[in-house]
Interface confidence: low
């Protein structure tokens, strides 16, 4: 199409293009439900799939729930975005123990510099505190870590990492040779500050890293801790649980260790839209009292599938469906998948809408 | 109960066109992603496209091998699918099965939980 | 375009043993803390059935003696005990990223 100045009636007859007076040009028209990424999309590939609030549209074209950052020691780095997730870091005064998708599974204090050491590099959202001797040069040789009244330059110091823990009281004392010592201490030995910022947005590679409560001496039993309203999943990742906040939703089974919170919809109400552990769409139940279906699943499988029952099967309870046949049409690039499912309120996909001509191009 | 059933299949010459048909019942069709998958005779499956709904814009994908030459379309008011096949080759020849997505939610997974019967196309001169 | 590679192409295994097959992936079909694996059943003159979603998810009807593992580019399916009307073709298809594939099959005898 011409680029400067068509007249308005340029792109007339094409029913896919409207004129924009003010880029005076004409540009493609986004079918229902898609929206442009510009002003003035040229091709099918301007137009994207919407996503629900809070959801943001991932890679892979998939409809993904943006992680929140409304645990206590977490503030957003960066908003819920069309195209990438907020993102949470830990708050001014911590950093970031055990890192999480888009977050922080756990935050400690940072570390304050003992006597006889300074502020080489102050702590980040990512990175504890880094002490130097406060007299340069004068590091005293160490046969074994036992015998260093103070660290050489550039080391971190087995300083008091605090952890943020509100999860487990259990936090505050730990077993140790038959007593108890303060658990920070533990921490301190149990947690290094990482040497390079951990990396916000992506899983932890370290696999160990805080035990449900500090190992008793002989014991294997300890996993990671993730912080509350987090659960670890089968990769081990520190994932946030869904929340049953919307009116429409009750909690039907907790946030646990290994396994999510569950919603469903509210008494009174059928879940039309299923989500992973949730509804995505809840809607009065019809008078004809269908009901709703909980897919049977290994109990060891993490996710419950919630499903409304086949619409079809009562044909007097079928909220939905304008009829009509849709054309063919076919997709100019074989581009990622789109995720949103058979859904009325969450779509649509980034692929090509429906084609004009039968040709595919 | 959920049924799918294919038609339209039989024999045809290479470069000639045929179209499948998959009438369904059992579930309300509008809101399903449908599928086109074939297999030629003792060879192993291989997905051809499928047909949004819809809520997404009626839009379709298709495997390289038959990109160009097939198209998916579906009449929701009938709860019926299309597979149009132009320009057939002998390898088109196989069993033709159409298959319901299953629309479990975010994210959306993409698998095959209903398939019809199937109905055979040989294409041959 | 990701290709499935099933192995082994058939295998024989005595009523009551554990069958596995396996189903690599020329690139990772895992995504946003989901792995886009599935698993079907086909048995001679029939259309294929579906046993496993999303790597390990078991469909609604599907005995429990089959399960999924696997994420990233290697998965795994298990049969245990094998019964006689497990005798099948099994199939692998992924829906990491367009266009889908399927693996090449295992057929899966019983002793």
């Known amino acids: 199409f011409p680029q400067d100045r068509p007249f308005e009636d340029t792109c007339h007859g094409n029913p896919s293009h409207y004129y924009d007076k003010a880029v005076r040009r004409c540009c493609y028209r986004c079918p229902m439900g898609l929206f442009p990424t510009q002003q003035c999309p040229q091709r099918p590939t301007d137009c994207r799939k919407q996503c629900e609030p809070d959801y943001y549209l991932d890679e892979a074209d998939r409809c993904t729930a943006c992680v929140t950052c409304s645990r206590d020691d977490l503030v957003e780095k960066t908003p819920c975005a069309w195209n990438s997730s907020r993102v949470c870091e830990c708050r001014p005064g911590m950093f970031c123990s055990t890192s999480a998708v888009n977050s922080c599974a756990r935050c400690f204090f940072h570390s304050v510099c003992p006597a006889g050491m300074i502020v080489k590099f102050p702590g980040t959202a990512q990175k504890n505190t880094v002490c130097e001797p406060a007299s340069p040069g004068v590091s005293p040789a160490c046969a074994s870590p036992e015998n260093c009244k103070e660290p050489s330059s550039g080391t971190i110091p087995q300083a008091k990492p605090t952890p943020v823990s509100p999860a487990t009281s259990s936090a505050s004392t730990m077993p140790v040779r038959g007593g108890t010592r303060l658990a920070q201490e533990a921490a301190s030995k149990l947690t290094r500050a990482p040497d390079s910022p951990s990396s916000v947005g992506r899983p932890s590679s370290d696999p160990g890293l805080s035990p449900t409560q500090p190992c008793p001496e002989g014991s294997g039993d300890c996993r990671k801790q993730c912080e509350p309203d987090y659960y670890l999943d089968e990769a081990g990742r520190c994932t946030a649980c869904v929340s049953c906040s919307r009116d429409d939703l009750v909690e039907k089974t907790p946030c646990a260790w290994n396994s999510s919170r569950t919603c469903e919809c509210r008494p009174g109400m059928i879940c039309a839209t299923s989500a992973t552990n949730s509804c995505a769409r809840c809607v009065p139940y019809p008078i004809c009292a269908a009901e709703t279906v909980t897919k049977p699943q290994d109990m060891a499988e993490k996710d419950t599938t919630f499903e409304a029952p086949p619409l079809g099967t009562q044909p007097d309870c079928n909220p939905t469906p304008e009829n009509g046949e849709a054309p063919a049409s076919t997709s100019p690039t074989q581009s990622l998948l789109v995720d949103s499912q058979a859904s009325k309120t969450l779509p649509i996909p980034t692929s090509a809408p429906v084609a004009l001509s039968s040709t595919g191009k | 109960e959920v049924k799918l059933v294919e038609s339209g299949g039989g024999l045809v010459q290479p470069g000639g066109s045929l179209r499948l048909s998959c009438a369904t019942s059992?579930?309300?069709?509008?809101?399903?992603?449908m599928n086109w998958v074939r297999q030629p005779p003792g060879k192993a499956l291989e997905w051809l496209g499928f047909i949004r709904n819809k809520a997404n814009g009626y839009t379709t994908e298709f495997s390289a091998s038959v990109m160009g030459r097939f198209t998916i379309s579906r009449d929701d008011s009938q709860s019926i699918l299309y597979l149009q096949m132009n320009t057939l080759r002998a390898e088109d020849s196989a069993t033709y099965y159409c298959?319901?997505?299953?629309?479990?939610?975010?994210?959306?997974?993409?698998?095959?939980?209903?398939w019809g019967q199937g109905t055979s196309v040989t294409v041959s001169s | 375009d990701i290709v499935l590679t099933q192995s082994p192409a058939s295998l024989a295994v005595s009523l009551g043993q554990r069958a596995t097959i396996s189903c690599r992936a020329s690139k990772s079909v895992s995504a946003s803390g989901y792995n886009y694996m599935h698993w079907y059943q086909q048995k001679a003159g029939q259309p294929p059935k579906l046993l496993i979603h999303?790597?390990?998810n078991l469909e609604s009807g599907v005995p429990a003696r089959f399960s999924g593992s696997g994420s990233g580019t290697d998965f795994t399916l298990n049969i245990h005990p094998v019964e006689e009307e497990d005798a099948s073709t099994y199939y692998c298809q992924h829906s990491g990223e367009l266009p889908f594939t399927f693996g090449s099959g295992t057929k899966l005898e019983i002793k």
């Open positions: 999303l790597a390990s």
């Open positions: 059992g579930f309300t069709f509008s809101d399903y992603y």
């Open positions: 298959a319901r997505d299953p629309p479990y939610g975010n994210p959306h997974y993409y698998a095959m939980d209903y």
